[in-house]
């Protein structure tokens, strides 16, 4: 999936299986990613688990779990708030669109989470205070929390190089992260589809093009569009909303 | 073991985090260090066998000597609101205000800095 980190780095990751997205003293978010096509390096999120840890007089521990074709509007125990404590309403789930869009507000830690199902896969977005982001007990184990540190270098896909290949007259072959590029989406069509929803040619737009070229699944256009929309709602600095290609970054510049 | 509470109170009191204090801030920094030391001493009985406690004690000793702080002298109150430790070390609070981050934060400092993370597509 494509990842926008807390530090506004943008990456495309091929991380497969379960990975920690956020892990601090208050919250744990884990995603499970699966290949979008058999044999493909490109993966998308098929499962999401969020654990809100027990906190003071506010909330009991609550677990939220979403999977492909199952986006619940309640925690795993059936509740929609933080439990029986005085401040239980400082944690709330709101269903925005049944089966497609859920918002979780954790006021006690100043955090808002948006989970969507777009097509077959899930998207995730969060707004969180820096103080909460950095509230980590075991500093030495911070290495692989994707939102904080980004993806390991060996798990990143260079989609800018992929795009350069795609733009050239010959179809990308070995350079492609997908062994079979769907012929149904010529580069020009992918560009047109993405332009419709994402007029600014930023990295969300580039991600959209990449996704259409690798999968042929038009739902990924919506995934990029909603990711940008959620960013508009959740990002505190509107000037930083659109991220653009940087000139080649040194490897490891993410952390 | 409430050592994490001591840690977060110290970092919030010094607010510049890991940066060394400017020379005119040293007395205030030393006062915050003495408060930190007192806080860790108060947790000693229930934290003495844990790594976090020993790290804090050694860290305090190092900072005290680096900044030539005397062991005796004034202590300070934390300047900004800190999140109490979560999970293992629950702090009891009868005030529902603690359950509203922004209300609780604004009492003590400027608006918090927010960050955003997103994951989507393939």
């Amino acid at each position: 999936p494509h990842l926008r980190t807390f530090t506004d780095h943008f990456q495309t990751c091929k991380v497969q299986g379960a990975w920690p997205l956020i892990d601090n003293n208050y919250l744990n978010v884990q995603v499970t990613n699966t290949p979008v096509l058999p044999g493909s390096a490109a993966t998308a999120t098929s499962k999401l688990t969020i654990i809100f840890k027990n906190f003071q007089e506010c909330v009991d521990q609550k677990v939220y779990q979403a999977e492909m074709d199952e986006l619940p509007s309640a925690f795993a125990d059936g509740s929609k708030n933080g439990g029986d404590k005085h401040g239980a309403n400082s944690l709330k789930i709101t269903e925005k669109v049944s089966g497609q869009h859920v918002e979780i507000q954790a006021k006690y830690i100043g955090t808002t989470i948006v989970v969507r199902q777009v097509g077959r896969y899930l998207t995730f977005a969060v707004r969180m205070p820096e103080e909460v982001v950095n509230a980590v007990e075991d500093r030495d184990s911070q290495g692989l929390y994707l939102c904080l540190r980004g993806c390991p270098l060996n798990q990143q896909i260079d989609f800018q190089a992929f795009r350069a290949n795609a733009e050239s007259p010959r179809r990308p072959a070995a350079a492609s992260p997908s062994p079979v590029v769907p012929e149904t989406f010529p580069y020009e069509t992918a560009v047109a589809k993405c332009k419709e929803k994402l007029p600014v040619e930023d990295l969300y737009y580039q991600a959209c093009v990449f996704d259409l070229l690798t999968t042929g699944d038009v739902n990924f256009t919506l995934a990029a569009y909603y990711a940008l929309e959620d960013g508009k709602m959740l990002h505190s600095n509107k000037d930083k909303l659109h991220l653009f290609e940087r000139t080649r970054e040194l490897p490891g510049a993410v952390a | 073991c409430k050592i994490l509470k001591c840690n977060s109170e110290f970092w919030s009191a010094t607010s510049s985090g890991s940066h060394a204090p400017a020379s005119d801030d040293v007395p205030e920094f030393c006062a915050a260090l003495r408060t930190y030391a007192l806080c860790t001493r108060r947790t000693a009985r229930t934290c003495r066998g844990d790594l976090a406690y020993h790290s804090a004690v050694h860290g305090i000793e190092d900072l005290m000597s680096q900044h030539n702080c005397s062991k005796d002298g004034p202590t300070s109150q934390p300047r900004v609101r800190t999140l109490p430790p979560a999970g293992d070390s629950q702090e009891r609070s009868d005030s529902p205000e603690i359950c509203h981050y922004e209300k609780s934060f604004h009492k003590h400092s400027a608006a918090p800095n927010y960050t955003h993370c997103g994951l989507f597509g393939d």
Partner: antibody, heavy 115, light 112 residues
Framework: EVQLVESGGGLVQPGGSLRLSCAAS????????MNWIRQAPGKGLEWIGM????????HYADSVKGRFTISRDNSKNTLYLQMNSLRAEDTAVYYC????????WGQGTMVTVSS | DVVLTQSPLSLPVTLGQPASISCRSS???????????LEWFQQRPGQSPRLLIY???SRFSGVPDRFSGSGSGTDFTLKISRVEAEDVGVYYC?????????FGQGTKLEIK
Amino acid sequence: EVQLVESGGGLVQPGGSLRLSCAASGFTFSYYGMNWIRQAPGKGLEWIGMIYYDSSEKHYADSVKGRFTISRDNSKNTLYLQMNSLRAEDTAVYYCAKGTTPDYWGQGTMVTVSS
Amino acid sequence: DVVLTQSPLSLPVTLGQPASISCRSSQSLEDSDGGTFLEWFQQRPGQSPRLLIYDVSSRFSGVPDRFSGSGSGTDFTLKISRVEAEDVGVYYCFQATHDPLTFGQGTKLEIK
């Protein structure tokens, strides 16, 4: 989720020895002090001793001093209790517990000292 | 050694009613830096002990707010505001201020 699993209990004759193990998971074992506590059948709880995160210090109850030794292997996430010169009054369920003062406990292992 | 004396040793309570357990220490549990280290544990029948309250009044993670602790010096109390069926078991106080660490003898709470 914090999990502590004790093992090594059983029947032993007075004067004999036994080594109990406690396998820890769900937390960073090497960061925490650990305790052993026991409970004789139908009786209350008795603290046996504790060990610091790095084994630098150990503290024992008077009733076991000189006979019991607590150790740990952080690379294996395991806590040990070596019990020598066992007596009938050492018959109990033995629990390991996380933290300098115990918060999470294991399910216990039964030690019976009898001839 | 510090001796902790609990009372009553047996406590029959009606469901929904409050309950109170006392723990008295043979010496003050306040240390020289002002900390008081008294904990309360619950042991349900056939189960391991579970931490309820630490540092006199701080409720541990996941403990319902009907449990509360109070006290200072040598006198401490555990209160259950409304007893529920799952509260049946033995309750122990425990001090960590002085070595060796010691437990009270336990109070058995049962439903009338």
